[in-house]
């Protein structure tokens, strides 16, 4: 799978994680930090 960094405009998209662009799927994806979940890593779980 080819990945690259998201466009600059997506800098604040992932609240607690890193935004990566999945080139083959044409999708932005939030790779969440440990303890966070959700489309934008907005939910904390214990």
């Amino acid at each position: 799978v080819s990945i690259t960094k998201c466009n600059s405009d997506m800098n604040g998209y992932c609240l607690h994680g890193q935004c990566i662009y999945l080139v083959d799927m044409s999708q932005n994806y939030c790779r969440c930090e440990v303890g966070y979940t959700g489309v934008r890593c907005e939910h904390f779980y214990l």
Partner: antibody, heavy 116, light 106 residues
Framework: QDQLVQSGAEVKNPGASVKVSCKAS????????IQWVRQAPGQGLEWMGR????????KYREKFEGRVTITADTSTNTAYMELSSLRSEDTAVYYC?????????WGQGTLVTVSS | DIQMTQSPSSLSASVGDRVTITCRAS??????IAWYQQKPGQAPRLLIQ???TLQPGVPSRFSGSGSGTDYTFTISSLQPEDIATYYC????????FGGGTKVEIK
């Protein structure tokens, strides 16, 4: 399936304000950004600004700064674009556009006519 | 704001011709450019995103290329149904549309 349904056509007097709504279904606007784009008759496409409904953060094109206000109501899954001090040059079709995880998905457009 | 200079503003070509449209950005947009087709009275239709990724259902005669500040959109063999206005859009840093290219049949 995913939809963005915009409010109906409006006719406004010069100097008035207009507020266009954009109701999302099939997805949560908090997972997206909502952009606004307009197109005057016979003219090109023009990006106006956008809102991040989750953070409640807005960014506007410089030329619209102070005259446009983009808001979102996450409880009704609806975004709004209000343009004030209308002039004849603001006559255009206004589109809301979803961006975020996937690339842009457009509403059907709302015609705003400014005429005395 | 990033500026997008699209050329030509209009062109006339024959059916079967190769048609090329260019967009130049005022700064590096890291391949974050999309191409739209718009026919009169219709909303814009997305053809290509991320420089060269064709949308599902879009004919393979449409293609895109480029990097840095210079990008190209090509119709390899113009068809009557391709008569429309085409716009580039940079979406690296906020959004800016090119001025559009009106494509007509000669």
């Amino acid at each position: 399936q995913d939809q963005l349904v915009q409010s109906g056509a409006e006719v406004k007097n010069p100097g008035a304000s207009v507020k266009v709504s954009c109701k999302a279904s099939g997805f949560n606007i908090k997972d997206t950004y909502i952009q606004w784009v307009r197109q005057a008759p016979g003219q090109g496409l023009e990006w106006m600004g956008r809102i991040d409904p989750l953070r409640r953060q807005t960014k506007y094109r410089e030329k619209f700064e102070g005259r446009v206000t983009i808001t979102a109501d996450t409880s009704t899954n609806t975004a709004y674009m209000e343009l004030s001090s209308l002039r004849s040059e603001d006559t255009a079709v206004y589109y809301c556009v979803r961006s975020g995880r996937e690339f842009d998905f457009w509403g059907q457009g709302t015609l705003v006519t400014v005429s005395s | 704001d990033i500026q997008m200079t699209q050329s030509p503003s209009s062109l006339s070509a024959s059916v079967g011709d190769r048609v090329t449209i260019t967009c130049r950005a005022s700064q590096d947009i890291h391949k974050y450019i999309a191409w739209y087709q718009q026919k009169p009275g219709q909303a814009p239709r997305l053809l290509i995103q991320y420089t060269s990724t064709l949308q599902p259902g879009v004919p393979s005669r449409f293609s895109g290329s480029g990097s840095g500040t210079d990008y190209t959109f090509t119709i390899s063999s113009l068809q009557p149904e391709d008569i429309a206005t085409y716009y580039c859009l940079q979406y690296d840093n906020l959004r800016t549309f090119g001025g559009g290219t009106k494509v007509e049949i000669k």
